[in-house]
């Protein structure tokens, strides 16, 4: 309800009938509430008769006349207590008083909500003096009210140390409803109940919710601000928005998607980055999240060799960053890649697959049976082995490294020696006697050098020995390399 | 002041269709909406159903849906009424309305003067 | 839907006597905030309808106080303390609690 200024017991008439400057506005003032179907002028309510002193904050002046006579009591007189008016209306109010002409440099501030109103504010003080008294009348206007003019308007004035404060100007700015909280878009699960909320506030109030759903209202009789639409599920994507609707019309909120989470469409750009005998670096782009974040992918590798089983390697990894590093594969080999991804939902489709090719590789193997025996007449050292498996070569062998290291007292000397891919034997001329040849053989591809063998001696002693038997890798099982003279 | 002023009278043959406009003045034509009321030669109101003036969004009672459709032109502040496949019972007075929902209810506080829709062969 | 029914049909009255006009819903009209939704409406001869009074008693801007509205649940009334000659007219009665919004089939108020 709207309160309005008190009416006093004791009038005094200070400044008889109304000032000059007294209460406008843009419209012609009502005493009738709005009614519901609004776009109304300001209503205005002023309680008083003309010339009334409130009681509220007065300042009695121990100052006396000529004449010895006792100064009455000073107060703001009473002005309207309350206007309301449409957003972007102009309006003016204004405070008066009687001001005894002895008191000199009266000012009038105007307040807001406790806070003093300066700067580029419409306020007009206007003076008139009379023989023993000074009517000033302090007019605040603004031309064009927004919200945010809301609020209790005073006037003070200080007058001998003490502080004249008017009876509050109630301003209410009255317009459409004005969205605090309008629906968010959503991504939902499909025929999963989810709510949304719209609120809006006037004044004037009550504000009511209308909800509509593709264009169609939801609810045909309103609810009040604030609202909260249970959905109790959806099969397909949907646009909401609300209505708010008060005495002075209408206003739509922002329409928002509720989109329905599905699964995944399959990734695309599925490419090789870099690719190594066992492994290849992949990247891909992300298909469409069907509206859930992803969660993790999953690289599918298949052997691309007709003769093969067919059988599929699965690697899972994050979702993030979009690449992985196919470990473990064969050299040389060719390879079906694909990558599916999965959110809350479940797993897409497989992406287009790729081929991919492992690069030649070293050998994983060394080779086998490796034997070394003392040829004395030529003063040579005979060295044979077994090819390591073709399986195992990792590419197309180019030839083999014999490591010897020649060890008597006090010398140690290694020489390399390269020799083809044809035969598998080799022989190399004894470097030192009476010394221990340890000889370590690997094979070579173009992807590199193999794992040694393990190491075979063979003592060559000094000139004049007869008979060597030779010496050989270990049989499997055997933890050292036996030399067999 | 809000002036709501619809077209002028139809006269047309079952099967036809008719457009009737509302257009308003003296207020913002998208804070509102607008309602369409039939009244037919000695009989009472029948409401129609409302558009949103703002979205567009209309809503129909149960006898109007299907042939009758609401619609808008913002930019001259207009509601239009169309009507198609008129019948015999379609010969009428139709009304459009401010219309929104205050602290009293729906608000029905202007009306247009009224179009007469006469359907004859 | 809900139903208005109005009466009487026709109601010849005495300029300067007091008229009542009545009506009744098929349902309560008492929604769940507390408000009755019952409004009614004016059509003078060859003019538009006119908002009268809405929430069953409330009077719009302009009308006189000789208007009165009265009743809740289903049962209303509408009175005229002083008929005037400017009061000649259909009066109706409609409902906007629930959907859809429907009218009284109308109360034609003629001088004698």
């Known amino acids: 309800a709207i309160t309005e200024a008190r009416e006093e017991a004791k009038p005094y008439p200070l400044f008889p009938g109304p000032f000059p400057g007294s209460l406008q506005t843009d419209h012609t003032p009502l005493l009738s509430l709005p009614h519901a179907s609004g776009y109304q002028p300001a209503l205005m309510f002023s309680p008083t008769q003309p010339g009334r002193p409130h009681t509220g904050n007065v300042a009695i002046p121990q100052v006396t006349s000529v004449e010895s006579k006792p100064l009455p009591p000073l107060a703001f007189k009473h002005t309207v207590g309350h206007i309301i008016l449409s957003e972007h209306k102009g309006v003016k109010f204004n405070c008066s008083i009687s001001v005894p002409n002895i008191y000199q440099d009266t000012t009038i501030s105007w307040w807001k909500d406790g806070k003093e109103l300066l700067g580029a504010h419409h306020a007009i003080t206007q003076f008139y003096p009379d023989d023993e008294v000074t009517a000033i009348i302090a007019s605040f206007s603004i031309t064009s009210v927004q919200r945010s003019d809301n609020g209790s308007y005073i006037c003070k004035m200080k007058i001998n140390n003490e502080e004249i404060v008017s009876d509050p100007i109630y301003i209410e700015v009255q317009g459409l409803p004005h969205f605090t909280k309008q629906p968010e878009s959503m991504n939902v699960t499909r025929n999963t109940a989810f709510n949304l909320t719209c609120q809006a506030v006037g004044p004037p109030e009550p504000v009511n919710i209308f909800w509509v759903q593709n264009s169609s209202r939801v609810n045909e009789q309103p609810e009040k601000s604030p609202s909260v639409l249970t959905v109790p599920g959806l099969t397909e994507m949907a646009v909401f928005s609300c209505e708010a609707h008060n005495d002075k019309g209408l206003t739509v909120s922002k329409g928002v998607q509720i989109n329905i989470k599905a699964i995944p469409s399959p990734p695309t750009e599925v490419s090789i980055r870099n690719s190594t005998a066992h492994s290849i670096l992949i990247s891909w782009v992300p298909g469409f999240d069907g509206y859930s974040p992803f969660r993790n992918c999953s690289i599918q590798v298949k052997e691309a060799d007709p003769l093969s089983n067919g059988s599929v390697m699965i690697f899972n990894t994050s979702a993030l960053p979009h690449l992985y590093q196919i470990k473990q594969l064969q050299a040389l080999a060719n390879y079906s890649i694909g990558v599916s991804c999965m959110n809350e939902i479940g797993w897409s489709a497989v992406s287009p697959w790729i081929l991919a090719s492992t690069t030649e590789g070293a050998p994983s193997v060394a080779p086998l049976n490796v034997t070394v025996f003392l040829n004395e007449s030529s003063d040579n050292v005979d060295i044979r082995w077994m090819k390591p498996p073709t399986k195992q070569q990792d590419g197309e062998l180019v030839g083999y490294r014999i490591s010897h290291v020649w060890q008597s007292a006090g010398i140690s000397k290694e020489l390399l020696e390269e020799v083809g891919q044809n035969g598998s034997r080799a022989r190399i001329s004894v470097q030192v006697h009476n010394a221990t040849c340890t000889v370590r053989i690997a094979a070579v591809t173009r992807g590199g050098v193999g794992p040694f063998s393990d190491p075979v001696k063979i003592f060559i002693p000094a000139h004049g020995w007869v008979d060597y038997a030779p010496s050989s890798t270990p049989a499997p099982g055997n933890a050292d390399p036996v030399l067999i003279i | 002041q809000v002036q709501l002023v619809q077209s002028g009278s139809e006269l047309k043959k079952p099967g036809a269709s008719v457009k009737v406009s509302c257009k308003a003045s003296?207020?913002?034509?998208?804070?509102?909406?607008m309602s369409w009321v039939r009244q037919a030669p000695g009989q009472g109101l029948e409401w129609m159903g409302w558009i949103n003036n703002y979205s567009g969004v209309s809503t129909y009672a149960d006898d109007f849906k299907g042939r009758f459709v609401f619609s808008l032109d913002t930019s001259v502040s207009t509601a239009y009424l169309q009507i198609s496949s008129l019948k015999a019972e379609d010969t009428a007075v139709y009304y459009c309305a401010r219309d929104y929902y205050g602290s009293g209810g729906w608000v029905f506080d202007y009306w247009g003067q009224g179009t007469t829709v006469t359907v004859s062969s | 839907d809900v139903v208005m029914t109005q009466s009487p049909l026709s109601l010849p009255v005495t300029l300067g006597q007091p008229a009542s006009i009545s009506c009744k819903s098929s349902q309560s009209l008492l929604d769940s905030e507390g408000k009755t939704y019952l409004n009614w409406l004016q059509q003078r001869p060859g003019q538009s309808p006119r908002r009268l009074m809405y929430l069953v008693s409330k009077l719009d801007s302009g009308v006189p106080d000789r208007f009165s509205g009265s009743g809740s649940g289903t049962d209303f009334t509408l009175k005229i303390s002083r008929v005037e000659a400017e009061d000649v007219g259909v009066y109706y009665c409609w409902q906007g609690t629930h959907f859809p919004r429907t009218f009284g089939g109308g109360t034609k108020v003629e001088i004698k």
């Open positions: 003296g207020n913002t034509f998208t804070t509102y909406g």
